[in-house]
């Protein structure tokens, strides 16, 4: 017996450890709260719908609710989608929530609410009202929130949700919220720090407002505060990709030197984009527990060379000084204060956008003795010259990021390393730094309607590469040639990213010779010329190689391509060669005794496997350990019969998606004795096999979504007991018979996807409808998108 109806257009999950019943009705085009929500529901999500009002009846009998997420049911017009504008704000009737005695969290963001709802239960600990039209905060409206701990009031008055009046906060409005820990007033045109704030606060977000001056006593009683964000007050507006108004005369946010004295527990201080020109050491006299300091997007290029304030930050773990370049100035080199050497706890240092020509070894000398330093980010600096050997001093670093610079190779094999022949005079330079959205987004912590938590913060390093160990990121530079002397003394590197350069040389197996420990090489987005089968062979420990998007020479005829270079890479596990337009190969086979994954998307196997040409049918055969092969997007409208005989023996996962396949030789799957996953999605298949179990006894996952399948064969799943996942969504299936879907097979399925088909809900569908209504198999979108196309009155109705 089911404990909720299948007609409920929501996903229901159990979180047993927390004893939570979670009902998620996100983006279901609802115009009312659906019936059938289980009465023991604890977490109810109704975000991204069009429910016009909430009344006491809305949550009647849902007495166990702990969290209601009712965001984005009437998004303010400038923020919302233009093809479905909400013109009547959400109405909340009195006492709608007052009976919910266990309610702890209530999210009402994006509903055009004019004021803080009244009649909230005393149990409430979190109230979120972002992106509404609340721009007057009065003490009387907060009286019911005695137990509130987290209060989000941001984005109620800013350029994307304008209020056209000055945001007002009554004096002492928050003072009686004696349990308040987190207060966010971000993106609100607030002109002063509200006073007096409760001393219980641990997080205070005041960023992107119009505060020009902090008063001496503004934070005087906040001795439990751990996070303070004042970013975007008196912003640095150069290159801002949003409307941006600096303070008068471009003056900085004025902060008295003793303003932070009471904040003895502060761990995170964000002063991003405050037009600061100097950082008074006195600010930090009393906040010696500070772990994270963001000073990006200011005018601190000169200060970076002095930076006495760093002497006061013994516990600092993260420091961001990015995009502090002086306008119109292209510095000869970087001047780091000796004070950096006092940051004994520092793990992450980011100095993007300082903008200088040459990175010299002595520039980094203040960092040499920082034993805890893990990440040094010098990306987007327009560096032209850098001798990479200097990084032998930084063996303990996990990431050295020099991406998005202008580093190019030296003209000889001298010790200069990477450099350019450019003049060494200091040029006037105005860099285009818009692409680095991490630093140039209006609100990098903004939440979307879909997620309650902030969006994941930007991580510039390729995570999969980073996990192998010490990483040097040289992506998006101007390197057109590499030689072994460039990598002298870098034998400790585990990952090298050369993606997005201009390398067009014929690699012969000598270029990376010093990199004896390298395990991951990203060579994507270059112009690799695979003339020699010895390419990359010097990388004896290489496990992952990415040579995707190197199509330049593959697109030209008559050029030698030695795809058998893999045989010399003895421990290679994963090879990515996507989007290369490979349509010819000098070597007929690829060979490897170690390779487990090959990504070969976006090539031209249709040419290599042209009818009548059998030379390349065994291209992958000698990849003896290969388990995963992705040959999606290879324009394969059919597969020659020899292809499956030429597949490697241990293949488990095969993807043939997005190929325009019109037919498929199902019987040939018998060649693939170990195949577990077959992805044939986004093709033009019209049929399924007569009996899947006759084609494969090992197949567990079959993905056939987005094809043209109109009907299923009579015994399609007969005896397919190993099948666990079947995706038939987005096809043209009209009918499913009992014989096609034997219950003893179906009951083994973990997931069956049937949505977006063309089911005919006639008498012939009785068994199917009955089964769908009774099965325990998970069928996503069952209530909303498994629908009838007819006949008549049934059109558009759910099959259940």
């Amino acid at each position: 017996a089911r404990w909720f109806p299948k007609t409920l257009p929501c996903d229901v999950t159990l979180d047993v450890p927390k004893n939570h019943v979670i009902v998620d009705c996100t983006d279901k085009h609802l115009t009312e709260i659906p019936g059938g929500i289980p009465t023991n529901t604890t977490n109810l999500t109704l975000t991204i719908n069009h429910i016009p009002d909430i009344s006491p009846a809305s949550f009647h009998r849902l007495d166990h609710l702990v969290e209601i997420d009712f965001r984005c049911n009437c998004v303010p017009i400038p923020l919302g989608s233009k093809n479905n504008m909400c013109i009547k704000r959400l109405q909340i009737k009195p006492r709608s929530f007052s009976g919910l005695t266990y309610l702890k969290s209530l999210y009402l963001d994006g509903n055009q609410l004019l004021e803080i709802p009244q009649g909230l239960p005393p149990s409430l600990q979190l109230l979120s009202l972002e992106a509404n039209n609340i721009f007057s905060i009065r003490k009387e409206n907060l009286t019911e929130l005695a137990n509130i701990e987290i209060l989000y009031l941001g984005q109620n008055c800013y350029y994307r949700n304008p209020c056209y009046v000055s945001y007002s906060i009554e004096k002492d409005a928050f003072l009686n919220l004696t349990k308040l820990k987190v207060l966010s007033l971000k993106d609100n045109n607030v002109t002063a720090v509200p006073t007096v704030l409760p001393s219980t606060l641990t997080e205070l977000y005041l960023y992107n407002n119009m505060i020009a001056k902090i008063q001496e006593d503004d934070f005087n009683n906040l001795n439990q505060l751990q996070i303070l964000d004042l970013s975007g007050n008196c912003p640095r507006c150069y290159n801002a990709p949003f409307p941006c108004a600096p303070c008068k005369n471009n003056s900085p946010l004025q902060i008295p030197v003793n303003a932070f004295d009471a904040l003895t527990e502060l761990k995170v201080l964000r002063l991003h984009s405050n037009s600061l020109q100097h950082v008074p050491p006195r600010w930090f006299k009393n906040i010696n527990k500070l772990q994270e300091l963001d000073l990006s997007q200011n005018f601190l290029a000169k200060e970076i060379g002095d930076a006495k304030f760093l002497h006061f930050l013994p516990s600092l773990i993260q420091l961001d000084l990015s995009f502090n370049f002086e306008l119109q100035v292209y510095r000869a080199s970087m001047n780091l204060s000796q004070a950096f050497s006092s940051l004994k706890s520092l793990k992450i240092l980011r100095i993007r956008g300082y903008v200088f020509k040459e990175l010299k070894s002595f520039n980094l000398s203040p960092l040499h003795n920082l034993q805890n330093l893990e990440v040094l980010d010098l990306g987007t600096n327009f560096i032209k010259i850098a001798n990479l050997s200097m990084f032998k001093q930084f063996k303990r670093l996990k990431v050295i990021d020099l991406s998005v610079n202008k580093i190019s190779p030296s003209g000889d094999s001298s010790e200069v390393g990477f450099c350019s022949n450019a003049r060494t005079s200091v040029e006037s330079y105005e860099p285009q730094v818009l692409e680095q959205l991490h630093y140039f987004r209006y609100d990098k912590y903004a939440r979307s309607c879909r997620f309650k938590n902030k969006e994941a913060s930007f991580m510039s390093v390729n995570e999969s590469c980073y996990k192998y160990g010490q990483t040097l990121d040289l992506s998006k530079n101007s390197i057109f040639f590499v030689k072994s002397s460039d990598f002298q003394h870098l034998s400790f590197l585990k990952c090298l990213n050369l993606s997005g350069n201009l390398i067009s040389q014929t690699l012969n197996g000598s270029e990376f010779q010093p990199l004896a420990e390298l395990r991951y090489l990203d060579f994507s987005n270059n112009r690799l010329d695979l003339l020699h089968s010895t390419a990359f062979e010097e990388l004896h420990k290489l496990e992952v190689l990415d040579i995707s998007s190197n199509s330049h020479y593959f697109q030209s005829e008559g050029i030698t391509h030695m795809l058998n270079f893999t045989k010399n890479l003895k421990v290679l596990q994963k090879l990515m060669m996507n989007d290369n337009d490979i349509s010819s190969s000098t070597s007929r086979t690829m060979e490897s005794e170690s390779l487990r994954t090959l990504e070969f998307r976006g090539n031209h196997l249709d040419v290599l496997w042209r009818e009548g040409d059998n030379r390349y049918l065994q291209l992958f055969k000698n990849l003896l350990k290969l388990e995963e092969l992705d040959i999606s997007k290879n324009s394969l409208s059919f597969l020659p019969s020899g292809v499956f005989d030429g597949m490697p023996p241990n293949l488990k996962n095969l993807s043939l998606a997005k190929n325009g396949l019109k037919s498929f030789s199902w019987k040939k799957l018998q060649c693939l004795k170990n195949l577990e996953t077959l992805d044939l999605s986004h093709n033009q298949l019209t049929t399924v096999p007569e009996r899947l179990s006759n084609c494969s006894r090992s197949l567990k996952n079959l993905i056939l979504k987005n094809n043209q399948i109109r009907s299923l064969t009579k015994y399609f799943l007969q005896d397919a007991f190993q099948l666990r996942y079947l995706d038939l969504s987005s096809n043209k299936i009209q009918m499913i018979q009992k014989t096609s879907f034997p219950e003893n097979v179906l009951n083994n399925l973990k997931m069956l996807l049937l949505h977006h088909n063309r089911f005919l809900c006639t008498c012939d569908a009785v068994w199917f409808v009955w089964w769908v209504n009774h099965t325990e198999v998970t069928i996503p979108y069952l209530a909303t998108d498994v629908t009838c196309v007819g006949p008549g009155a049934h059109k558009g109705q759910s099959v259940i």
């Epitope: 005087n220 003793n258 004295d261 003895t264 008074p280 006195r282 006299k285 009393n286 006495k308």
Partner: antibody, heavy 116, light 106 residues
Amino acid sequence: QVQLQQPGAELVKPGASVNLSCKASGYTFTNNWLHWVKQRPGRGLEWIGDIYPSNGRTNYNEQFKTKATLTVDKSSSTAYMQLSSLTSEDSAVYFCARERGYFDYWGQGTALTVSS
Amino acid sequence: DIQMTQSPSSLSTSLGGKVTITCKASQDINKYIAWYQHKPGKGPRLLIHYTSTLQPGIPSRFSGSGSGRDYSFSISNLEPEDIATYYCLQYDYLLTFGAGTKLELK
């Protein structure tokens, strides 16, 4: 209004110790650094050290580290400076001062005479 | 640490006249300088902070200016009660006093 009250004078013998007091009123005592400054006859002002009453954190001028000990009594909003092993070199006027980056209010000073 | 060189060490002047005292820092102090008046038997009195910001209740005949390493303090229209010793204090990095300027009547 802000006031810092100090006794006018203290007379002590060489080798002894003395505890100078500074009673604060008219502001939140715990939230402001309190400093001590020495002035010997005909000489300039010499910084001794400071204390943050809220958590008792202290900083000292290297030259006074073994000479001075700063403490507070939050209940009476009073700061103390103990000077030990006194010599004639310690004869001076000692000021307490509230600091908000700069010193904005000073006590009248205590004239300490070390003499047998 | 930052040194403050105050000059002159003493200054003879007449009532109604104007005096100027300078303080030179050993490095840029970013305008974080204060000026004090000190009379015998009293605590020093704050006149100006952040180079030129006059404390409430201080007459406008007192003024300050400067930037970088060089700062000056002036009294115009000298009055009898202005006879005292004047000190500068830098508070950009730690705290350092100037040696003082003793103002005397001619």
